[in-house]
Interface confidence: low
């Protein structure tokens, strides 16, 4: 039953620059805004609230909390009104690695 | 026209005021007589890109929603001896 739900590795139907990149290492989570906005001044929102002090394509959280920091993320450029949206839920741990079974 | 993500017990559901379009990623199952897509158990790390179904003239109001779960089911804790 659950085989139906496995994530597809064949993500070909949208160009890569339109995707968020999520990198997780230990307790650090880095979310990279899609490239569609170029390198303009980027604004980030989390659950519809502006993330103060975040203006790069990368939003980094050194001590990500699954409870507090999971949710809706949006990024957009000052010059473009269109937003890109990400729903992220991540469980992190300081001294662990993810093994591919 | 924004996709909303809901968790009910251990499953992940996407819903729209119209229906949910899968652009790529986890297939999910469209619930009958509903505007909801069941992405399955969250421990299977559903991931993909989705948007609400909209008419041609409204499509710019239906942004993409990327979904990314990482529930660490295959995480191995390292101790100092490892």
């Amino acid at each position: 039953q659950d085989e139906d739900f496995k994530a597809s590795d064949d993500l070909t139907s949208i160009s890569p620059e339109k995707r968020f990149k999520v990198s997780i290492s230990g307790t650090e989570v880095v979310v990279t805004c899609p490239d569609v906005f170029g390198y303009d001044n980027i604004k980030w929102e989390k659950n519809d609230n502006l993330v103060e002090g975040a203006s790069n394509r990368e939003l980094s959280q050194k001590e990500f909390s699954e409870v507090d920091d999971s949710g809706y993320y949006a990024c957009y450029a000052d010059s473009i009104k269109e937003k890109s949206y990400l729903y992220l839920r991540a469980r992190v741990c300081a001294n662990c690695i993810e093994v591919n079974l | 026209f924004k996709v909303s993500v809901e968790e009910l017990e251990d499953r992940v559901f996407l819903s729209c005021n119209t229906s949910v379009l899968r652009i790529e990623g986890t297939m999910g199952i469209q619930l009958p007589h509903s505007r909801t897509l069941d992405l399955g158990k969250r421990i299977l790390d559903p991931r993909g890109i989705y948007r609400c179904n909209a008419t041609e003239e409204q499509s710019d109001k239906a942004p993409y929603m990327q979904v990314y779960y990482r529930m660490c089911q295959n995480c191995v804790e390292l101790n100092s001896a490892t």
């Epitope: 409870v67 | 968790e7 251990d10 499953r11 969250r42 421990i43």
Partner: antibody
């Protein structure tokens, strides 16, 4: 319907180790959820102690003398609290987050009263 | 670590609205959950994520959260609402769940 049931000794001597177990029915103990221990001293408020979710996180108040483990095959998780003092006399609850309420405690056991006395 | 402040007790007249507050530094940026605990019973979650109500919780219970204060409102308090009420958040810096000290509501 998910139910949680605590069990353990009602009386513990000072300096001993408290061992409590929470048996889960109507569901299984898996790493998908946070499985918590919370206590309430007489006439006081609620105090979160820690959780198990494959790995563990503990309230710094108890760091060094607390251990939470799980036996997924038996669908139960346990609390060990070492070096008990009379200040540890409390009602001990096990609890789990809700599917839609991450970080909140949607399911609770009825609690088990632990008295520390010689 | 993060501190949540609640008034120890509050009185409300039967069928009148009751407002129970929970103070914390920039609490508006956190998810606040509320619990009701009746004498000799386990707590029951009555509000989660600031204002969401679990199935089976009466509509008279509602929640709001902004700035430095979260508020639980009972639109018309009934005798059965006499209980202790606790707010709770997750303190991500301390990696710990934090409860307020609780407010005992008496319905007169």
């Amino acid at each position: 319907e998910l139910t949680l049931q605590e069990s353990g000794p009602g009386l513990v001597k000072p300096s001993q180790t408290l061992s409590l177990t929470c048996v889960v029915s109507g569901g299984s103990v898996t790493r998908s959820y946070y499985w918590n221990w919370i206590r309430q001293r007489p006439g006081r408020g609620l105090e979160w102690m820690g959780y198990w979710t494959g790995s563990t996180i503990y309230n710094p108040t108890f760091q060094g003398r607390i251990s939470i483990t799980a036996d997924t095959a038996k669908s139960q998780f346990s609390l060990q609290l070492r070096s008990m003092t009379t200040e540890d006399t409390a009602m001990y609850f096990c609890a789990r987050e809700g599917g839609k309420s991450l970080g909140a405690f949607a399911y609770w056991g009825q609690g088990t009263l632990v008295t520390v006395s010689s | 670590s993060y501190v949540l402040t609640q008034l120890p007790s509050k009185n409300v007249t039967l069928k009148q609205p009751a407002h129970i507050t929970c103070g914390g530094d920039k609490i508006g940026s956190k998810n606040v959950h509320w619990y009701q605990q009746k004498l000799g019973q386990a707590p029951v979650m009555i509000i989660y994520y600031d204002s969401s109500r679990p199935t089976g919780i009466p509509e008279r219970f509602s929640g709001a959260n902004s700035g430095n204060t979260a508020t639980l409102t009972i639109s018309g308090a009934l005798a059965e609402d006499e209980a202790d009420y606790y707010c709770q958040v997750w303190d991500s810096s301390a990696k710990a769940a934090v409860f307020g000290g609780g407010t005992h509501l008496t319905v007169l």
